[in-house]
Interface confidence: low
Amino acid sequence: GITNINCSGHIWVEPATIFKMGMNISIYCQAAIKNCQPRKLHFYKNGIKERFQITRINKTTARLWYKNFLEPHASMYCTAECPKHFQETLICGKDISSGYPPDIPDEVTCVIYEYSGNMTCTWNAGKLTYIDTKYVVHVKSLETEEEQQYLTSSYINISTDSLQGGKKYLVWVQAANALGMEESKQLQIHLDDIVIPSAAVISRAETINATVPKTIIYWDSQTTIEKVSCEMRYKATTNQTWNVKEFDTNFTYVQQSEFYLEPNIKYVFQVRCQETGKRYWQPWSSLFFHKTPETVPQVTSKAFQHDTWNSGLTVASISTGHLTSDNRGDIG
């Protein structure tokens, strides 16, 4: 910003310093320089002198007009050519912004990731506003009527310790910026219904050379939730379409899931879980790759997830754990 200039005059914008993108705007500059009757007044946008649409209004004032202004931000300042001054004299400067009022926030979602100690609330903010937009998340207890408000620029993490008003809450989001304010619909939540189990992780895979070769995927979670439903999806890396298997799971021991796969093909696996009967799923786990052997048994462990495959022998390879799923935000 250039709001701290020691001004020798005044610069202002009509209709306002922050305005709706695409509007026609006027920028006025009025000089108040000692011993100077300006010969000429100049406008600069982002340091570049403007040459068109400038109108001299009177001895000390000029107007710059922009049609359909589309830049999100610009730094404007104006200068005067004073007689007996070799250089232009700075009059004043102003930062201007254009953008949009916020859309109504929708798809408000609140979840508690097991062990996180937080309720995480997110929403779809709608189209880009281009200007500073703040969100106020309202959390109101349906039991005590007590309401808490949280100011944020995006999503919010609310400590579950601060949710002292029982289990049932209403949550809604207000979006506000200089051009407008909107409010979401209210979401009713029960804290017990929004817990997402601790992440499920695929640790290794092996293909057993039986009459029909069988691949076993080993996977686990640290969840303490008793009734958990999971999905494992898999596909050949050359395919677009996923196959999905469903499981009712008890994580008191490592899970083993069996697949009958084509030989000598590279497959990718992912898993996700939810508390049985509840609404929200985990994001899909990291991509886990396994190449089925031509005929000889092969093991792939979570530790070995490079794209290097030894043909013929049992392979163990180590995963860095940084591969991410293609839709890691899928919790709905």
Epitope: G1, I2, G47, Y77, G93
Partner: nanobody
Amino acid sequence: EVQLVESGGGLVQAGGSLRLSCAASERTVSTYTSGWFRQAPGKERDLVAAIRWSDDFTYYADSVKGRFTISRDNAKNTVYLQMNSLKVEDTAVYYCAGHSFSALIPPVSFWPSWGQGTQVTVSS
């Protein structure tokens, strides 16, 4: 971030002159603006003069107009503040600063690069 080192401060009598130098650790981009700020004890840090490298556009605070001159040497990557007709009220720590924003003179907090400061004392 560009490292800036000032030099040239000292004690001078009222009416005298000093030349401050500010050397940058690396070549600055053409959109770069260099400035000299000063801070007297108990006062805020104020911009004294600024120069934009792309077109040599300069700015001076009213209190120093006609007495101070800001200039630069591209080859040496250095900015100078020539201070003539010094007054007792010019006594302060002088800081060199720089930024690459499009605005010539953003608020103090927008200047990301700062020198360590050099003391200028003007005695009567």
